[in-house]
Amino acid sequence: SERCDDWGLDTMRQIQVFEDEPARIKCPLFEHFLKFNYSTAHSAGLTLIWYWTRQDRDLEEPINFRLPENRISKEKDVLWFRPTLLNDTGNYTCMLRNTTYCSKVAFPLEVVQKDSCFNSPMKLPVHKLYIEYGIQRITCPNVDGYFPSSVKPTITWYMGCYKIQNFNNVIPEGMNLSFLIALISNNGNYTCVVTYPENGRTFHLTRTLTVKVVGSPKNAVPPVIHSPNDHVVYEKEPGEELLIPCTVYFSFLMDSRNEVWWTIDGKKPDDITIDVTINESISHSRTEDETRTQILSIKKVTSEDLKRSYVCHARSAKGEVAKAAKVKQKVPAPRYTVELACGFGAT
């Protein structure tokens, strides 16, 4: 056969679907690889062909579109399963071609099982709610296109295993779940089960997402440097190890990049000749506020090193701050014999 532009196996689009539920999978060619859509391609006389490779097999085979009740069908650039079976797992390829043009891409499809509490190997999207922020909501994801707007589905929401009914601060409103107050206790997995009729059959769509309650932007502050501070002086003798921690608190801010760095005499440690090491650790509060600690370490400090300026810097979307460490050379105590001699008036 003639050459075909092969985009390979698109593992970035690892598609997971639940067993025994409808699934509609769009050919990724039009979404991520080609500059034109299906309608344009179809108008230009291009044909979309689907085939697949079963799990643990190498043989590409055509998809059987003649199954009872049209269990697998194709509509425009969408491959439909009504419903999926466990052994539909495999690598699926969609190929767009005519006599002069060919382009194809493969993607993995995994059909996963869930238990009665909706636990499964499915990778869950995370939705962040601000703590104590006012009315916020989550929406049942990825259900568009499964039924026409004339069909009114029933939607049931669960937190973990429990149906949300009289949940006090959480109100089910069809496709939306409204949180009158978002609290730490609302952290967890929320599942919407959408039930709709089609051609005399009843189908269920199960969608689970993780809710994480995070710090409110109203409470967010610029970075706070807890250490170094004015109360601690790093007093060392030459030859000793100098350890200075820089500990910074960052309020949670959506999509903010939190940074901590040291400068020594105004330069980054990498840009100077001192043998300095910096170790970083990060911890998070329950609302994803972040504490970063960078420990600056000089194994054998020199008297020159003890005269340098050591400044900890921090930056977030809320602002930038800096704090200098108080470093000084320890004044050696007078030797005991000299002290005695002086005491007795020796010259």
Epitope: E132, G134, I135, I171, P172
Partner: antibody, heavy 122, light 110 residues
């Protein structure tokens, strides 16, 4: 005793302004509650005006007709709710009630004040 | 905006009667419905919230039902102190958050 007490109602000319207050006692404004204003014209039914979240965000919600003319606010340190009313019209004449909404109890409006009368007339 | 329509606007009943008031929302409000009782010169008093939950201290003769757009308040055996005006109140939290009241139902002595 847990209660709400409105004040600030008065006779005001059309086009004038007025600020209503609602002092809470027996409970603290906190992230559990929303505080709201509802009005009732003489001999008429209840009409929702506005709500504010008592938590740090202070998110506000208005009836479409109240947007722009009315402003809800609160001072948690004083445990007081306010309604600033501008460009007043004759049809704003009503008893104005403040109410507490318990966000931890399915949004129930569980506590109401006795109301303050606002009369807009020339 | 959501509109709440109550019926009837008034009704005459006797002590001991079973009374039913209905409330219809202009859009799906799920279970976001409350019922209030108001007596002349007084503030409204919460009876039912979340469509069917009885508020604290409210006698069990009051009950609420319904979801979506159609709701009902039932007083199983009318008592003398129940003669008052009753309001339904709907809420929508998703989308544009808003609350709205029905126009009221006045229950008078027959």
């Amino acid at each position: 005793e847990v209660q709400l007490e409105e004040s600030g109602g008065d006779l005001v000319q059309p086009g004038g302004s007025l600020r209503l207050s609602c002092a809470a006692s027996g409970f603290s404004f906190s992230s559990t509650y929303y505080m709201c204003w509802v009005r009732q014209a003489p001999g008429k039914g209840l009409e929702w005006v506005s709500c504010i979240y008592a938590g740090s965000s202070g998110s506000t919600y208005y009836a479409s007709w109240a947007k722009g003319r009315f402003t809800i606010s609160r001072d948690n340190s004083k445990n007081t709710l306010y309604l600033q009313m501008n460009s007043l019209r004759a049809e704003d004449t009503a008893v104005y009630f403040c109410a507490r909404v318990d966000g931890s109890s399915s949004g129930s409006w569980d506590l109401w004040g006795q109301g303050t009368l606002v009369t807009v007339s020339s | 905006d959501i509109q709440m329509t109550q019926s009837p606007s008034s009704l005459s009943a006797s002590v001991g009667d079973r009374v039913t008031i209905t409330c219809q929302a202009s859009q799906n409000i799920y279970s976001n419905l409350a019922w209030y009782q108001q007596k002349p010169g007084q503030a409204p008093k919460l009876l039912i919230y979340a469509a069917s939950l009885l508020a604290s201290g409210v006698p069990s003769r009051f009950s609420g039902s319904g979801s979506g757009t159609d709701f009902t308040l039932t007083i199983s055996s009318l008592q003398p102190e129940d003669f008052a005006t009753y309001y339904c109140q709907g809420a929508v939290y998703s989308g544009n958050t808003e609350w709205a009241f029905g126009q009221g139902t006045k229950v008078v002595i027959k």
